[in-house]
């Protein structure tokens, strides 16, 4: 039950996280104009990974896409790549994890296969979350660097009474969404990996063999043998729920859907 809950919760947390990563990637407010020097601006600038926008106090907002690839900073391209990789891995992870969910039966899929799929999706979620966190952090670092650079030469033209104030940018909402979403995806991935350990068949009970001693019958049953493969694809390492001694010719029954509660 705990395994199913952990797996289900991991899936839901990852789903929310990946939705957040997608939202953050699409958001325009990765960087927003710093209003410290001019809190009463009539023009507010903000930028995303794909376009930059200007919101006027009149109520009009004008957005322009970055219609160039070569002209964009390498760091921005790197952030885009990290976010897209994060989304793709997350999406594949979600697809895999749907089939790995314990509460969903797909044909005669064995638990070892589900365990493998759970681990795979968990790792994908972890990498996806790390990609998002890395992407957002790279962008944030870029902002901090540019912020202090523009602060150093805040007033570029001081000829006479004329001032040319450089626009500085600070953290936008998308960064916080990205960090939280990346963290959730990462946590979801870890939960899936933990659930995978619980899903993996850990013990193999050999078929009980009856030894007939003279005079009275004693059933000998060898102790449980720890499976060395953990959650490998060894289908022979199946748990046998035997109520007592069995004969040599008794057929081993595979676990039914009621065997794991």
């Amino acid at each position: 039950m705990a395994v199913t809950a952990c797996q289900g919760l991991g899936f839901v947390v990852s789903l929310i996280g990946i939705a957040g990563i997608i939202a953050a990637t699409c958001m325009d407010q990765w960087s927003t104009q710093d209003l410290y020097n001019n809190p009463v601006t009539a023009v507010f600038n903000y930028q995303g990974l794909w376009r930059s926008c200007v919101r006027e106090s009149s109520g009009f907002t004008e957005c322009r896409g970055y219609f160039t690839l070569l002209g964009l900073p390498a760091m921005l391209q790197a952030v885009r790549a990290l976010m897209i990789v994060g989304i793709v891995l997350g999406a594949i992870g979600l697809l895999v994890s749907i089939f790995a969910l314990k509460c969903i039966r797909i044909g005669s899929m064995e638990d070892s296969a589900k365990a493998n799929m759970t681990l795979t999706s968990g790792i994908m979620f972890i990498v996806s979350g790390l990609c998002a966190i890395a992407g957002v952090s790279v962008f944030a670092n870029m902002l901090v660097t540019n912020f202090w650079m523009s602060t150093a030469n805040m007033y570029t033209g001081m000829g006479g009474m004329v001032q040319t104030v450089q626009t500085r940018y600070t953290f936008g909402a998308a960064l916080f969404v990205g960090w939280v979403a990346g963290g959730l995806t990462l946590i979801g991935g870890v939960m899936m990996c933990i659930a995978c350990r619980g899903l993996a068949p850990e013990e193999t009970n050999y078929k009980a063999v009856s030894y007939h001693a003279s005079g009275h019958s004693v059933a000998y049953k060898p102790g449980g043998f720890k499976a060395s493969t953990g959650f490998g694809s060894n289908t022979k390492n199946k748990k046998i729920y035997d109520g007592g001694a069995r004969t040599e010719d008794e057929v081993q029954s595979y676990p039914s859907k009621h065997d794991y509660v």
């Epitope: 009539a42 600038n45 200007v54 106090s57 009149s58």
Partner: antibody
């Protein structure tokens, strides 16, 4: 046709109050930021106040801060300027104006004259 | 506050001649986000409210004759009337619409010589 019609002007004593109204027609007021601008007799234009489309952002000129209050009633398609503690230097024609692309004032009312005199 | 200074304060030009009005701001009105200058020009005739001529320093408002043009960037701007007509007699104002308070220039009175 877009129209802005101001009303509520008149003669008032120093220290008195007045409430100006601006009725909009031909467009939906709640899509635009709105301004009040005044012009003293024979003088230039002076911006007075601004209110954003959702009333979330409001600005005032230093000369009227603390005395004037801008507000709007979007369902009624109306803009208001409550003027308290009026002074002789507040005597002017008050215009309401609709903001446009580039923050420009694209449409202006005909204005209403406010005279502050004892 | 951004101070807007217009020159000249009055101008007399012959019909059909070019009229040029200058406007200088104490701070740059160029917005780096969209590379547009937040300066507007208005025309006000006696007894009438002002009329928008130019926004974004050089974009002509619809319905405004093409003899009116705006130019300039940063802190220095110009309104040009290529061929003065009798109906152009008015007071012209430039306005900072980049930062609050939205300040106006003192106005330039244009007359026919």
């Amino acid at each position: 046709e877009v129209q802005l019609v101001e009303s509520g002007g008149g003669l008032v004593q120093p220290g008195g109050s007045l409430r100006l109204s601006c009725a909009a027609s031909g467009f939906t007021l709640n899509n635009f930021g709105m301004h009040w601008v005044r012009q003293a007799p024979g003088k230039g234009l002076e911006w007075v106040s601004y209110i954003s489309s959702g009333s979330g952002t409001i600005y005032y000129a230093d000369s009227v801060k603390g005395r004037f209050t801008i507000s709007r009633d979007n369902p009624k398609n109306s803009l208001y300027l409550q003027m308290n503690s009026l002074r002789a230097e507040d005597t002017a024609v008050y215009y309401c104006a609709r903001a446009y692309y580039g923050n420009a004032f694209s449409f202006w009312g005909q204005g209403t004259l406010v005279t502050v005199s004892s | 506050d951004i101070v807007m200074t217009q020159s000249p304060s009055s101008l007399a030009v012959s019909l059909g001649e070019r009229a040029t009005i200058n406007c200088k701001s104490s701070q740059s009105l160029l917005n780096s986000g969209n590379q547009k200058n937040y300066l507007t020009w208005y025309q006000q005739k006696p007894g009438q409210p002002p009329k928008l001529l130019i926004y974004w320093a050089s974009t002509r408002e619809s319905g405004v004759p093409d003899r009116f043009s705006g130019s300039g960037s940063g802190t220095d701007f110009t309104l040009t009337i290529s061929s003065l007509q009798a109906e152009d007699v008015a007071v012209y104002y430039c306005q900072n619409v980049y930062s609050y308070p939205l300040t106006f220039g003192q106005g330039t009175k244009l007359e026919i010589k």
